[in-house]
């Protein structure tokens, strides 16, 4: 069964679980003793087309309802757990008095006054954040919404929207709360070459091949222009007229501590003596900054097998 | 000294196509990004994009996505921006400039545009 | 797109006052990762290319006057001229370079009263 919650002595207006899209009549009931909840407003608790109206919640309503859409082929039941609670006296609102949670984002956000949709309700809807009425500018209640511009990680929080509820010539107060937080947008930063280290000195065999591989990491998310590239004697290796030498086609991307990283290699065919006296430059390099670490390579010491 | 020196102005027809150049000198040309940026007469000042001259790495302003291409040559140290689809509304003064940088050993911190091109006045008019 | 607002749009000093032109982003323009703002500062006479004065939101560019500060932190900022001269008749820009798009104010003129 569903469950509805509401606060004692505010208005709660709950539908049957059951009703999809029909347009069929609507029977309530208590659960536990069969009874015909009525549909004349004069009572506190009626029902109205497919809804149940507590018009002032009490605690003593919490049970559990029934609700059956009578239609020719067949009747469908619901059942609909509802628990009415006093007031909590502080501020800490708990978790069963909380609807779902918002996410939002670095830009602009709005949160939705929840179960709004069920009143007859006029604006302004009045929202508090962890009890305290929001007054910045930043804040703009617009029809059911609450709209937050620049949001920081220091707008997360329990958001609390109330409202009236008209019924009958007669005012309700309604008030629904939901947590609000900031998705962990993502960072960008000087780039870190995480290998080769900085004047780092790689052993070679003359006619062999060599691959160098530079990795480095540039934040998390969207990176804007984030590159890294290989240059020789400070010439990008398209431009330095050495067919042996070529810088891999496509970076590798990859993830690294919760950091967006790329790799590029540098792939020798075959080692020359030029080789060795060659400067080989990892370049990293984003909006922030370029950094630059240099290579060397030398001839590999035969072992020693005496 | 370090200089970027723009080519001249032109005069287009609505609809047509203009490349300005924009050639660096006194520095490396690969270790900055150049930007573009343009002012309209009495206007301020408009970002368009930008480029790193070693990979060619572009990124540019929403608004003219689609019509600019911004290249650069290493071989002549020199910057390109091609401006497409011409409209009266793109009369204006472009500018090149290059991205300041703090060097320290090896590092470049980037930041704001401290070498700035002559501009090239594009008057677009039927 | 971060949105650079500049105040006042004109501004007119007496030579040797003090001149301050105010600029606010939309949203914070500094970077937790290294404490740097990441604001410019540009002036540009008629006919003229823009011309750096103030980086990093407050340090100098070289051969600028040391009349020219900047300052602030976050999404407020201020440029001060503390003594206006003739040669700073001119009109303001402040950009941000923390997130693409740059942007920059709508550029604030000065002239003399």
């Known amino acids: 069964s569903k469950s509805s919650w509401g606060l004692e002595n505010e208005a709660l207006i709950v539908r049957c679980p059951q009703r999809g899209r029909s347009t069929y009549p609507v029977e309530w009931y208590y659960s536990d003793t069969n009874e015909s909840i009525p549909t004349q407003k004069r009572n506190r608790i009626f029902v109205s087309r497919d809804r149940l109206k507590f018009l002032p919640a009490r605690v003593e309503d919490s049970g559990i309802y029934a609700c059956v859409i009578r239609s020719p082929n067949l009747n469908k039941t619901g059942y609909l757990n509802v628990t009415i609670h006093k007031k909590p006296p502080s501020c800490n609102i708990p978790d069963y008095l909380m609807y779902s949670t918002v996410r939002g984002s670095d830009k602009n956000f709005k949160i939705t006054c929840p179960t709004i949709d069920l009143y007859n309700w006029t604006a302004p809807v009045q929202w508090f954040k962890n009890c305290k009425a929001l007054q910045e500018p930043r804040f703009r209640a617009h029809r059911s919404y609450l709209f937050i511009d620049n949001v920081t990680h220091d707008d997360e929080g329990d958001y609390t929207c109330q409202f009236t509820h008209a019924e009958n010539g007669t005012n309700y107060i309604v008030t629904a709360t939901r947590s609000f937080t900031v998705e962990e947008k993502g960072f960008s930063m000087f780039p870190v070459i995480t290998n080769p280290p900085y004047n780092h000195t790689m052993e070679v065999e003359i006619g062999k091949p060599a691959s160098i591989a530079c990795s480095a990491c540039f934040g998390k998310g969207s990176h804007f222009l984030a590159d890294v590239l290989w240059q020789i004697n400070k010439t990008v290796v398209g431009n330095f007229g050495e067919a042996r030498i070529q810088e891999e086609e496509g970076r590798n991307e990859s993830s690294s501590n919760d950091m967006d990283c790329l790799t590029s290699v540098l792939r020798i065919t075959g080692v020359t003596e030029k080789d060795l006296s060659l400067e080989y430059d990892c370049l990293a390099l984003n909006l922030h900054g370029m950094i630059r670490h240099t290579i060397r390579l030398r001839r590999k010491q035969p072992i020693d097998h005496r | 000294q370090v200089q970027l020196v723009q080519s001249g102005a032109e005069v287009k027809k609505p609809g047509s196509s203009v490349k300005v150049s924009c050639k660096a000198s006194?520095?490396?040309?690969?270790?900055?990004?150049i930007h573009w940026v343009r002012q309209a007469p009495g206007q301020g000042l408009e970002w368009m994009g930008i480029?790193?001259?070693?990979?060619?790495?572009?990124t540019y302003a929403q608004k003219f996505q689609g019509r600019v291409t911004i290249t650069a040559d290493e071989s002549t140290s020199t910057a390109y921006m091609e401006l497409s689809s011409l409209r009266s509304e793109d009369t204006a003064v472009y500018y090149c400039?290059?991205?300041?940088?703090?060097?320290?050993?090896?590092?470049?911190?980037?930041?704001?545009?401290?070498?700035w091109g002559q501009g090239t006045t594009v008057t677009v008019s039927s | 797109d971060i949105v650079m607002t500049q105040s006042p749009d004109s501004l007119a000093v007496s030579l040797g006052e003090r001149a301050t032109i105010n600029c606010k982003s939309s949203?914070?323009?500094?970077?937790?990762?290294?404490?740097?703002?990441?604001l410019a500062w540009y002036q540009q006479k008629p006919g003229q290319p823009p011309k750096l004065l103030i980086y990093?939101?407050?340090t100098r560019e070289s051969g600028v006057p040391d009349r020219f500060s900047g300052s602030g932190s976050g999404t407020d900022f201020t440029l001060t001229i503390s003594s206006l001269q003739a040669e700073d008749v001119a009109v303001y820009y402040c950009?941000?370079?923390?997130?693409?798009?740059?942007?920059f104010g709508q550029g604030t003129k000065v002239e003399i009263k």
């Open positions: 400039a290059r991205v300041g940088a703090t060097v320290t050993k090896n590092y470049y911190y980037y930041y704001g545009m401290d070498v």
């Open positions: 006194g520095y490396r040309f690969t270790d900055y990004y």
């Open positions: 480029i790193q001259p070693t990979g060619g790495g572009t």
């Open positions: 949203q914070s323009v500094l970077y937790s990762s290294n404490n740097r703002n990441y």
């Open positions: 990093w939101a407050s």
């Open positions: 950009q941000q370079y923390y997130s693409v798009p740059l942007t």
